[in-house]
């Protein structure tokens, strides 16, 4: 057992198995569930994380299903199909041959159908609105301090370039974080806003995906910012296609 083996971990994803058996004896980590090699210098894709989450033994799973407040991601957890790059496949099906189309964050964007359902392309989610409600504090947070702290968090913890944090809105006790990232804006190596939002969501729930790190300790000028509920809204580059029946 060498020091190299001790070093061979995945700082950004604890749901991996790592060993120094990569090219030239380099460290290589594979995601649980899919066995796909992951890049541990950045966030793992939400698709691979969901797959790993679903592969964990039921009795060992300390993770919770999304709360009843998850208005947008109504379908909650499922075992997704991921492409070779770890992205969601446009069409997802369950074991009973019920299929549906998803966007780039894996959220259903059509009615459910059968195996004949066609999903021509993976539609990109280019705008994410994270709606938070914080616990009561002695006074309101200073807006510019809050803005700076959340931008810092997304850069330093989730590796997201500050240009993709479009705005931080605050009306006590509601905080809204707007993430925007068009296909044309996202360069190779850029963290996807959907992955950053998912890591943040899991952090807020106390289910950090980072290896051996403490949970999220969010403070604004030393004052703890404790979140009591989260809603995440996803806007796609092409509007979703639901029947009127669902809308009623």
């Amino acid at each position: 057992h060498t020091a190299a083996q001790d070093n061979c971990t995945c700082p950004t994803n604890k749901m991996t198995v790592c060993s120094p058996d990569g090219p030239g004896g380099r460290c290589q980590c594979r995601a649980l569930g899919s066995g796909m090699a992951v890049d541990c210098s950045t966030l793992t894709s939400k698709c691979l994380l969901l797959k790993a989450r679903m592969s964990a033994p039921k009795n060992a799973r300390t993770l919770v299903r999304p709360s009843e407040h998850a208005l947008v991601d109504n379908d909650g957890l499922y075992d997704p199909d991921c492409d070779p790059e770890g992205r969601f496949k446009a069409r997802q099906c369950n074991q009973t041959s019920v299929c549906w189309c998803v966007n780039s964050v894996g959220v259903r964007r059509t009615d459910k159908g059968d195996l004949s359902l066609r999903c021509d392309e993976l539609v990109r989610t280019h705008h994410i609105l994270i709606d938070l409600r914080h616990r009561p504090t002695a006074g309101a947070f200073n807006h510019s301090d809050l803005d700076a702290e959340l931008r810092r968090l997304f850069r330093e913890r989730y590796r997201l370039h500050p240009k993709f944090v479009a705005a931080v809105h605050y009306e006590q006790p509601t905080i809204q974080i707007e993430l925007r990232q068009n296909t044309s804006q996202k360069a190779a190596g850029d963290v996807d806003i959907g992955d950053a939002a998912y890591y943040f969501e899991r952090d807020i729930k106390g289910e950090s995906l980072f290896q051996g790190r403490g949970g999220l300790d969010l403070r604004v000028r030393g004052e703890p910012l404790q979140v009591e509920r989260t809603l995440i809204y996803y806007l796609d580059e092409i509007p979703p296609k639901f029947s009127m029946k669902r809308l009623t």
């Epitope: 190299a4 070093n7 950045t42 500050p162 360069a187």
Partner: antibody, heavy 122, light 109 residues
Framework: QQLEESGGGLVKPEGSLTLTCKGS????????WMWWVRQAPGKGLEWIA?????????TYYASWAKGRFTISSTSSTAVTLQATSLTAADTATYFC???????????????WGPGTLVTVSS | FEMTQTPSSVSEPVGGTVTIKCQAS??????LGWYQQKPGQPPKLLIY???TLASGVPSRFKGSGSGTEFTLTISDLEAADAATYYC????????????FGGGTEVVVK
């Protein structure tokens, strides 16, 4: 723990070369970043490229270095920098350095090699 | 993105104090390092995280600041402090920009 660069020397304009950075007393198979930085005679420090030596091999390049410089890590003991189409402006001491954290955006260099001099001249 | 370091050169007597400033064109939180480089040697890390002293660095070296304005203060100057000092950040490395300041030469009289 030490780093050592090799491969420097005299190169003709438009020529190419490969610089190698080897570590001793530690293994590159960890969760950190390796960096190449250069310094022209009497000038300041200039970042060229960085590579993650854990699982993944992510790379970043200075805008001016893209296409002409290639950083790679094919083993757990060495990082290389390939340079092409060299000009007199590339004459410099080339350093490799080890980043102290696994987060590329919060990195600082706690271990440096002594540097290798590259002279581009006909 | 740019790191602007001032002054480019400073001269102070032994026992004096030198202050070097580094300004980032964008907010980099506290992600700044300071290095000392002597002729013919590689740089040596002095301070990281804007204010944390690297191992083995004397407490005469002090870093401060956050956001866009940073300062390195060297007090009780010694002859051995004569060197060039650089600030550095990697916060915007994905923009392909050089994160090093231009350097400050410190001459000890």
């Amino acid at each position: 723990q030490q780093l050592e660069e090799s491969g420097g020397g005299l190169v003709k304009p438009e020529g190419s070369l490969t610089l190698t950075c080897k570590g001793s007393g530690f293994d590159f198979s960890g969760t950190y970043w390796m960096w190449w930085v250069r310094q022209a005679p009497g000038k300041g420090l200039e970042w060229i490229a960085s590579i993650y030596v854990g699982s993944g091999s992510s790379t970043y390049y200075a805008s001016w270095a893209k296409g002409r410089f290639t950083i790679s890590s094919t083993s757990s003991t060495a990082v290389t920098l390939q340079a092409t189409s060299l000009t007199a402006a590339d004459t410099a001491t080339y350093f490799c350095a080890r980043g102290a954290t696994n987060n590329v955006f919060m990195n600082y260099f706690n271990l440096w090699g002594p540097g290798t001099l590259v002279t581009v001249s006909s | 993105f740019e790191m602007t370091q001032t002054p480019s050169s400073v001269s102070e007597p032994v026992g004096g104090t030198v202050t070097i400033k580094c300004q980032a064109s964008e907010d980099i939180s506290s992600n700044l390092g300071w290095y000392q480089q002597k002729p013919g040697q590689p740089p040596k890390l002095l301070i990281y995280g804007a204010s944390t002293l690297a191992s083995g660095v004397p407490s005469r070296f002090k870093g401060s600041g956050s956001g866009t304005e940073f300062t390195l203060t060297i007090s009780d100057l010694e002859a051995a402090d004569a060197a060039t000092y650089y600030c550095q950040t990697s916060y915007y490395i994905d923009d392909g920009v050089n994160g090093f300041g231009g350097g400050t030469e410190v001459v000890v009289k």
